[in-house]
């Protein structure tokens, strides 16, 4: 799996979207998981309905929702009110039993907004990003990551 | 932008403990893993093990298990490791450490290091 | 535990040279996720440790084109192209991949 990078303001909302076969995971509950840094645990932050037939139904855990079109084969995720502890590596997964198919890596990364004035110290500007050699971008603001490539900001 | 400061060197005597902080500030605390690593005078580098201040999951050197206890107090972003019952060979100099990037865990942001010394 | 042996132990260069530095794993060092946590680092007298080097290959941010990594499986080498006077130092190697993360022992890089 790459790893996709979606960008979003702070104060703002990020969708994060994660396409997968609907028939491949016909019936099969989906997570959003925070991983503990690239080599840690992911860690459960919202899943969809426990009815898999009312997965379109948006659960929230806190600031983030999830929701999935199970025909169209997209799962959604809503990170509200983007907060620089909120920027890190997340997985969307397929859940069967007691395993997890990752369906996505994601990279989420939280920009300062232009507009504010106030001390960004956690925050970075894209500006001061490396920029990916040969990254496929995605604009929703969102780019796959290739292996070896590093966003790099100076202060995250 | 990224820092970590130590805290000050240690004179300590033998059957003593220290806690030694990890003070850090431009980032996030919680989003990156924290490593300490130990530095005898002439000799090469230990890690001593790593700690999520997000979760408190962490790793230990199963050698500093009973001598190292890593904690992490997010209100002040500041990490510790508290060493117990000290001897000669604990006397070191200790680095706090931290990930590169969420994508690159290579140490890329240490502190200063903190020199413990112990003696009589 | 891996064990990462480093060798040699001690390089003396001339500046301008090619200094080359060798690192033997005991063990295959591939994270369960895939990757190689091979990295290098270098630490002056009285400074802290510097990363050069992250998976097995990938140059940091501010490194030295120089400077570059190389290998797989057990045996890794980091490489530099035209010694200058502000390499000089002791480099390690470092394996992040399996609990106790384990650094080489050092090589000293000195003048000739």
């Known amino acids: 799996h790459n790893t996709t990078v979606f960008q979003g303001v702070a104060g703002q909302s990020l969708q994060v979207s994660c396409p997968y076969d609907s028939m491949k995971h016909w019936g099969r509950r989906k997570a959003w998981c925070r991983q503990l840094g690239e080599k840690g645990p992911c860690q459960r932050v919202v899943s969809t309905h426990n009815l898999w037939l009312l997965s379109f139904l948006r659960r929230w855990n806190g600031s983030t929702a999830i929701t999935d079109d199970t025909l169209g084969g997209t799962l959604t995720i809503t990170l509200r009110n983007l907060q620089p502890h909120d920027a890190g590596l997340y997985q969307c997964q397929s859940l069967h039993g007691s395993e997890a198919d990752t369906l996505r890596k994601v990279l989420v990364e939280v920009l300062a907004d232009p507009l504010d004035h106030r001390d960004a110290g956690d925050l970075w500007f894209p500006g001061e990003s490396e920029s990916f050699e040969d990254a496929h971008v995605e604009h929703s603001i969102s780019r796959s990551l290739l292996e070896g490539e590093i966003p790099f900001p100076p202060t995250s | 932008q990224v820092q970590l400061q130590q805290s000050g060197a240690e004179l300590v005597k033998p059957g003593a403990s220290v806690k030694m902080s990890c003070k850090t500030s431009?980032?996030?605390?919680?989003?990156?893993?924290i490593t300490w690593v130990k530095q005898r005078p002439g000799q090469g580098l230990v890690w001593i093990g790593d700690i999520y201040p997000g979760s408190d999951n962490s790793n230990y050197n199963e050698k500093f298990k009973t001598k190292a206890t890593l904690t992490v107090d997010t209100s002040s972003s500041t990490a510790y490791m508290h060493l117990s019952s000290l001897t000669s060979e604990d006397s070191a100099v200790y680095f706090c450490a931290r990930e590169a990037y969420y994508t690159n865990p290579g140490f890329a942001y240490w502190g200063q290091g903190t020199l413990v010394t112990v003696s009589t | 535990d891996v064990v990462m042996t480093q060798t040699p132990l001690s390089l003396p260069v001339s500046l301008g040279d090619q200094a080359s530095i060798s690192c033997r794993s005991s063990q295959t060092i591939i994270h369960s996720n895939g990757n190689t946590y091979l990295e290098w680092y270098l630490r002056k007298p009285g400074q802290s440790p510097k990363l050069l080097i992250y998976?097995?290959?990938n140059r940091f941010s501010g490194v030295p084109d120089r400077f570059s990594g190389s290998g797989s499986g057990t045996d890794f080498t980091l490489k530099i192209s035209r010694v200058e006077a502000e390499d000089l130092g002791v480099y390690y190697c470092?394996?992040?991949?399996?609990?106790?993360?384990?650094f080489g022992g050092g090589t000293e890089l000195e003048i000739k």
């Open positions: 431009g980032y996030p605390f919680s989003n990156f893993w």
């Open positions: 470092f394996q992040g991949s399996h609990v106790p993360y384990t």
């Open positions: 998976k097995v290959s």
